[in-house]
């Protein structure tokens, strides 16, 4: 039994960080393997993580780690059994994926603006809490090339536009993701889709 | 939110006994070592004892001046961590804090404290 | 056991100034890039409150004027511009080892 692609890891910078790998055939991992970390620091505590199937050859290990901070370094040891598979180390900051925006709603009853709200999904006391940006992506049901991107670089978790900007009469839908520059995270997965049907009063055009 | 609540102390003859609670929530309890630091009136901070978590074996470890008195013990379906203390002498009078660490052992949680009185 | 040795035991300083508080290990607490070192800062009635960690990191929440810096046996927090909520007795403690051993606090005071 032998690793064919390294654990590669990635953290929530909450409570979890997600490694995966491939072996080098068809493996039950939670039977067959475990994952063990632990913090470098001396007096820390050791760790297991169970891993799960993740494709035929693919593992996947949920580390939980509450209190992550930009010193912590991690020591991870993949087992099979009595056999040590791999050893290497993980420091969470250096590779962040932020957890997902939560509850994006789309506020139609302002006259003609779309208000686009969501939840930062960090708690206040999260370092991440204040750093996250936003990107929002807009896009029709019925036109494929109808697709856009929104930038969100103030703190704020909302977007307004102009509900003339978009076609009227027409079903739309729109997601959220994050990512914090200070971390130079990779982009969170984007939150669920969340769908209105676009209509304004034109305005009146004199001949 | 991390929380610490000890209880159990109180006012206990020398050679008494008395056992120290501490109720811990907001944070996965089973990860974590925990250890009792107590501060005699108007004194210093001293470390007391250490229990690790299953990962580490629930390995016990001591203060020389309360080895062989004190048994730190926990239970991690109810999340708490307890002092017992034997033989009780009036030097063992001190604020006890139940303290959580962050990392290896340095410790960003404390709960407010249960006051022993040994006396006469 | 290490023994942890802390200087001045007091400390009267003007506001806006600053405050320097030494501690002193009996041997090394530092090992692998990784220095030992930790600081706490307690107030009348209440527990400690951890204020650097790791020598030099500074805990979240903790104002920008705490710093601490150092290695081996010899380590420092300075405070700077002191404010009057400042005023507490300040406590370094190593995690070399097990005993875990505490210095013998500095009271901060303002001049």
């Known amino acids: 039994m032998k690793v064919l692609q390294e654990p590669t890891c990635v953290s929530d910078y909450m409570s979890i960080s997600t490694c995966e790998w491939k072996m080098n055939g068809p493996t039950n991992c939670s039977t067959e393997l475990r994952l063990l970390y632990q913090l470098v620091f001396l007096l820390s505590e050791a760790h297991t993580c169970i891993p799960e199937n993740n494709g035929g050859a693919g593992c996947v290990c949920h580390l939980l780690m509450d209190d992550v901070v930009s010193a912590d370094n991690y020591t991870l040891d993949l087992w099979a059994g009595q056999q040590l598979l791999w050893k290497g180390s993980f420091k969470p900051s250096e590779h962040v994926k932020p957890r997902a925006p939560g509850n994006l709603t789309v506020h139609t009853n302002v006259s003609d603006t779309l208000l686009l709200t969501w939840s930062n999904p960090y708690p206040p006391d999260n370092y991440l809490y204040n750093h996250l940006t936003y990107a929002v992506n807009i896009w029709s049901e019925n036109d494929p090339a109808d697709f856009r991107i929104y930038n969100v670089t103030y703190l704020e978790p909302s977007l307004r536009i102009a509900a003339s900007t978009l076609k009227s009469g027409i079903s739309y839908r729109a997601r959220v993701r994050a990512w914090a520059q200070c971390y130079n995270t990779t982009w969170s997965e984007w939150s669920p889709s969340t769908k209105w049907h676009n209509s304004y009063r034109e305005p009146f055009e004199q001949h | 939110e991390v929380q610490l609540i000890e209880s159990g102390g109180g006012l206990v003859q020398p050679k008494g006994s008395l056992k120290l609670s501490c109720a811990a929530s907001?944070?996965?309890?089973?990860?974590?070592?925990m250890d009792w630091v107590r501060q005699a009136p108007g004194k210093g901070l001293e470390w007391v004892a250490r229990?690790?978590?299953?990962?580490?074996?629930?390995?016990?470890n001591y203060a020389d001046s309360v080895k062989d008195r004190f048994t730190i013990s926990r239970d991690d379906s109810q999340s708490m961590v307890y002092l017992q203390m034997i033989n009780l002498k009036t030097e063992d009078t001190a604020m006890y804090y139940c303290?959580?660490?962050?990392?290896?052992?340095?410790?960003?949680?404390w709960g407010q404290g249960t006051l022993v009185s040994v006396s006469a | 056991d290490i023994v942890v040795t802390q200087s001045p035991a007091s400390l009267a300083v003007s506001l806006g100034q600053r405050a320097t508080i030494s501690c002193r290990a009996s041997?090394?607490?530092?090992?692998?890039?990784?220095?030992?070192m930790h600081w706490y800062q307690q107030k009348p009635g209440q527990p400690p409150k951890l204020l650097i960690y790791?020598?030099?990191n500074l805990e979240s929440g903790v104002p920008a004027r705490f710093s601490g810096s150092g290695s081996g046996t010899d380590f420092t927090l300075n405070i700077h511009p002191v404010e009057e909520e400042d005023v507490a007795i300040y406590y370094c403690?190593?995690?070399?080892?097990?005993?875990?051993?505490f210095g013998a606090g500095t009271k901060l005071e303002l001049k």
């Open positions: 229990i690790r978590s299953k990962g580490s074996n629930f390995e016990t």
């Open positions: 403690q190593h995690s070399r080892e097990l005993p875990l051993t």
């Open positions: 303290v959580r660490h962050r990392g290896g052992a340095w410790f960003a949680y």
């Open positions: 790791l020598a030099s």
């Open positions: 907001g944070f996965t309890f089973n990860m974590y070592a």
């Open positions: 041997k090394s607490v530092s090992t692998s890039g990784y220095s030992y």
